[in-house]
């Protein structure tokens, strides 16, 4: 009797089970009683990442320069083309459709991890003890000077966002 | 239901070319499937002559040693067979067929 | 070309007995998917014939399930569990994995 189910990598038609055709292949006609599923390759622009008993191919990403993006990885018959973003700028969401500046840390903020193209810049306030005095994509909030190390005493505190200031050592008893 | 009906001459003359039209109904020759020509001498067993595919592509059988065509008019559903240079081995019932569904077959004899 | 060879070429038996006719290819009938394009065919004088096993095993539909086949490679079997008065007839293997499509030369099936 006909089958009801099919095997892994088959699907069911007209009481045949069909073999499913392999990444980076489309569907021509379904098997028959007679015939085997027909399939054929995607052209150089299109892809099937599975098997499948799709009809057309999906089209390669297109990375828009307009839109910041470039060719990370090109695409096959089975992958999709893979953007990222130019120099300074990253990905907006997980499927990287645009790219937006990467944003700078503010004073009183340091660079935890640089950007990527697929990641924006991660900021954390300066602790005690560091500051930041710049807004920069790229530098980490940096230590208070040691006074002492220089035989100097601290004149002005340090904050998060600015150093400490350091004086010669009151010479009088 | 699938249907197929052969039309074409009963008598066709040595060295003339038979020709034969098998009407399809019930489902477009188009669509999938392999539309086959066999034929039966009488008395005989049976004999695959060729195919036409529902892309249009054919494949025939070598021992009939290119005498034989397979078309369609898919504007009327129908595929046909030309087979030339008759002799009097060619005399059979030929029938066209899906291979699940067939035509209730037509007799050509050849002779003069 | 697939040869087939058919056996018995005929066979005469009664209602009720269980019958086995065998078909032969002389190459594999197995794709390269691990298909097998192997079927059987029932013909009854002046008619067409029609299928009754496709791709080895499967039942077309409408046919009795007394009617089976099986096999794999180059050796396969129809088998009739229990005769029935309809079922003495000529039967015929065909193969369609490889062009050209080749039938056995028939097993006659008739009445002791």
């Known amino acids: 009797e006909p089958p009801t189910a099919c095997r892994e990598k088959q699907y069911l038609i007209n009481s045949q089970c069909c073999s499913l055709c392999q990444p980076g292949q489309k569907l021509v006609s379904d098997c028959t009683e007679f015939t085997e599923t027909e399939c054929l390759p995607c052209s150089e622009s299109e892809f099937l990442d599975t098997w499948n008993r799709e009809t057309r191919c999906h089209q390669h990403k297109y990375c828009d320069p307009n839109l910041g993006l470039q060719v990370q990885q090109k695409g096959t018959s089975e992958t999709d083309t893979i953007c990222t973003c130019e120099e300074g700028l990253h990905c907006t969401s997980e499927s990287c459709e645009s790219c937006v500046p990467h944003r700078s840390c503010l004073p009183g903020f340091g660079v935890k991890q640089i950007a990527t193209g697929v990641s924006d810049t991660i900021c954390e306030p300066c602790p005690v003890g560091f500051f930041s005095n710049v807004s920069s994509a790229f530098e980490k909030c940096r230590p208070w000077t040691s006074c002492e190390t220089k035989d100097l005493v601290v004149q002005q505190a340090g904050t998060n966002k600015t150093d400490v200031v350091c004086g010669p050592q009151d010479r009088q008893r | 239901e699938v249907q197929l009906q052969e039309s074409g001459p009963g008598l066709v003359k040595p060295s003339e070319t038979l020709s034969l039209t098998c009407t399809v109904s019930g489902y477009s020759i188009t669509s999938n499937y392999y539309w086959n020509w066999i034929r039966q001498p009488p008395g005989k067993g049976l004999e695959w002559m060729g195919y036409?595919?529902?892309?249009?592509?054919?494949n025939y059988n070598p021992s009939l040693k290119n005498r034989v065509t397979i078309s369609r008019d898919t504007s009327k559903n129908q595929f046909s067979l030309k087979l030339s240079s008759v002799t009097a081995a060619d005399t059979a019932v030929y029938y066209c067929?899906?291979?699940?569904?067939w035509g209730q077959g037509t007799t050509v004899t050849v002779s003069s | 070309d697939a040869q087939m060879t058919q056996s018995p070429s005929s066979l005469s038996a009664s209602v009720g007995d269980r019958v086995t006719i065998t078909c032969r290819s002389s190459q594999s009938l197995e794709n390269t998917n691990g298909n097998t394009f192997l079927n059987w065919f029932q013909q009854k004088p002046g008619k067409a014939p029609k299928l009754l096993i496709y791709r080895v095993s499967n039942r077309f539909s409408g046919v009795p399930s007394r009617f089976s086949g099986s096999g794999s490679g180059t050796d396969f079997t129809l088998t009739i569990s229990s005769l029935q008065p309809e079922d003495f007839a000529t039967y015929y293997c065909?193969?369609?994995?490889?062009?050209?499509?080749?039938f056995g030369q028939g097993t006659k099936l008739e009445i002791k």
């Open positions: 067929a899906r291979l699940d569904y």
């Open positions: 065909l193969q369609v994995t490889h062009v050209p499509f080749t």
């Open positions: 036409i595919r529902y892309d249009g592509s054919n």
